[in-house]
C-alpha cells in the first residue's frame, strides 16, 4: 500500500478519506487506528457502527468521528481540534472476523494555525452552533508519499 | 416467510416513465438492501442498482444514471423503483431482490414486473 | 465493468446425468461468485454464493467450484426439476455482473 498524506491546519477539522469496492467489502465494518512506530501494531481510535446497514450513522471516540458510504465505497474519518500530537501514520481498515484489510495508508500532518496570534475574542467555541458540521468547514489536503519518503522520522 | 411482491405490468409509450413497487413481507425490511435488476426479453439480467432502506442511500449502474430513481417507504416496507425517459429497448421483466449482508447476492427476489415501452 | 463469460451457452442432458457448466471472469473476483437458476416465466432463485456455499434449502446435488477467474457449477445427478437456464453473477467488483446464461434442455 502506498501511503496518502492528509495535511491539516492546528485547531481545525481534517477530513481523510479512504475509497474502497463496496463489493469486496459488502457487510464488513471499518476502523480507523494509529500505527504505533513502523513496524509496531495498529491501535484501533474508532470503528464503524455494529450494524453494518446503519454504517452511514457518525460515530465518534473523543475528537475522531468514522462513516462509512457503504454503497458508495468511502470511508471517512473527521479529526477535530486537530492537534500537533494528532500527526503520524494511520490505517483505514475493513474488518471480517479477528481479520483486517488495509483499505488505505494515511499519514496525517498538521500544519502550524496561521492564525494563532489572533484574539481570544475572535475563537469560535462549539457551544455556538448546533451541530459542528453545520458551523465550521473542513479543510484537507493529500497527496501520495513520494517513492523513497519515510512517512517516520529516522529514530536517534 | 420472505415475500417481495411487485405491482402489476405496465405498459408505456416511449419518452414516458415507470414507477414499479416491491412491498417486502416476512422479514425486517430496514435489516437488507434491496436492489433491482433487469431482464429484456430472451435475455440475460442486468443489475439496475441498489438502495439502503434504512438511509435511503443509492447506487445506480452508470448504464441508468440520471434516469433511475429508487425510493422506499419503511412505513409500510416498500421499495420503488423509477425510470424516466422510457425507450423501446426499456421494455423488459423489472425484479426487485433483496441482498444479505455477508454477501452481495440476492437471496430473495419479486416475482417480476413486465414493462413493455410502445408507441 | 467485468465480463462474465459462461460455456456452454446450451446443452442436452438426460436425468441421473452429471452437469458440468463453468464461467469464466475477465479479471480476477477471488471468490466472489454466485450462481442462479431460473425457469420459464420465473425469478431467478439463489444456488451458491462465494463459489462454493449452497444457499438455505437448495438440494445438496449442486456443488460450485473455483476461484480467481475459473469457475464451476456441477448438478450431480441432474433431476428433472432441474431443467432449466442457470447464470453466474460475479460480486467481487462494481458493478456486479452476470453471465449470458446456460441453458440445460432435456436429451
Known amino acids: 500500500h502506498n501511503t496518502t498524506v492528509f495535511q491539516g491546519v492546528a485547531g481545525q477539522s481534517l477530513q481523510v478519506s479512504c475509497p474502497y469496492d463496496s463489493m469486496k467489502h459488502w457487510g464488513r465494518r471499518k476502523a480507523w487506528c494509529r500505527q504505533l512506530g513502523e513496524k509496531g501494531p495498529c491501535q484501533r481510535v474508532v470503528s464503524t457502527h455494529n450494524l453494518w446497514l446503519l454504517s452511514f450513522l457518525r460515530r465518534w471516540n473523543g475528537s475522531t468521528a468514522i462513516t462509512d458510504d457503504t454503497l458508495g465505497g468511502t470511508l471517512t474519518i473527521t479529526l477535530r481540534n486537530l492537534q500537533p500530537h494528532d500527526a503520524g501514520l494511520y490505517q483505514c481498515q475493513s474488518l471480517h472476523g479477528s481479520e483486517a484489510d488495509t483499505l488505505r495508508k494515511v499519514l496525517v500532518e498538521v500544519l502550524a494555525d496561521p492564525l494563532d496570534h489572533r484574539d481570544a475574542g475572535d475563537l469560535w467555541f462549539p457551544g455556538e452552533s448546533e451541530s459542528f458540521e453545520d458551523a465550521h468547514v473542513e479543510h484537507s489536503i493529500s497527496r501520495s508519499l513520494l517513492e523513497g519518503e519515510i512517512p517516520f522520522p529516522p529514530t536517534s | 416467510q420472505v415475500q417481495l411482491v411487485q405491482s402489476g405490468a405496465e405498459v408505456k409509450k416511449p419518452g414516458a416513465s415507470v414507477k414499479v413497487s416491491c412491498k417486502a413481507s416476512g422479514y425486517t425490511f430496514t435489516g437488507y438492501h434491496m436492489s433491482w435488476v433487469r431482464q429484456a426479453p430472451g435475455q440475460g439480467l442486468e443489475w439496475m442498482g441498489v438502495?439502503?432502506?434504512?438511509?435511503?442511500?443509492?447506487v445506480y449502474a452508470q448504464k441508468f444514471q440520471g434516469r433511475v430513481t429508487m425510493t422506499r417507504d419503511t412505513s409500510i416496507s416498500t421499495a420503488y423503483m423509477e425510470l424516466s425517459r422510457l425507450r423501446s429497448e426499456d421494455t423488459a421483466v423489472y425484479y426487485c431482490?433483496?441482498?444479505?449482508?455477508?454477501?452481495?447476492?440476492?437471496?430473495?427476489w419479486g416475482q417480476g414486473t413486465l414493462v413493455t415501452v410502445s408507441s | 465493468d467485468i465480463q462474465m463469460t459462461q460455456s456452454p451457452s446450451s446443452l442436452s442432458a438426460s436425468v441421473g446425468d452429471r452437469v458440468t457448466i463453468t464461467c469464466r471472469a475477465s479479471q480476477d473476483i477471488s471468490n466472489y461468485l454466485a450462481w442462479y437458476q431460473q425457469k420459464p416465466g420465473k425469478a431467478p432463485k439463489l444456488l451458491i454464493y462465494?463459489?462454493?456455499s449452497l444457499q438455505s434449502g437448495v438440494p445438496s446435488r449442486f456443488s460450485g467450484s473455483g476461484s480467481g477467474t475459473d469457475f464451476t457449477l456441477t448438478i450431480s445427478s441432474l433431476q428433472p426439476e432441474d431443467f432449466a437456464t442457470y447464470y453466474c453473477q460475479q460480486h467481487g467488483h462494481s458493478p456486479t455482473t452476470f453471465g449470458q446464461g446456460t441453458k440445460v434442455e432435456i436429451k
Open positions: 462465494r463459489a462454493s
Open positions: 431482490a433483496r441482498i444479505p449482508s455477508y454477501t452481495y447476492a440476492f437471496d430473495y
Open positions: 438502495i439502503n432502506p434504512v438511509s435511503g442511500n443509492t
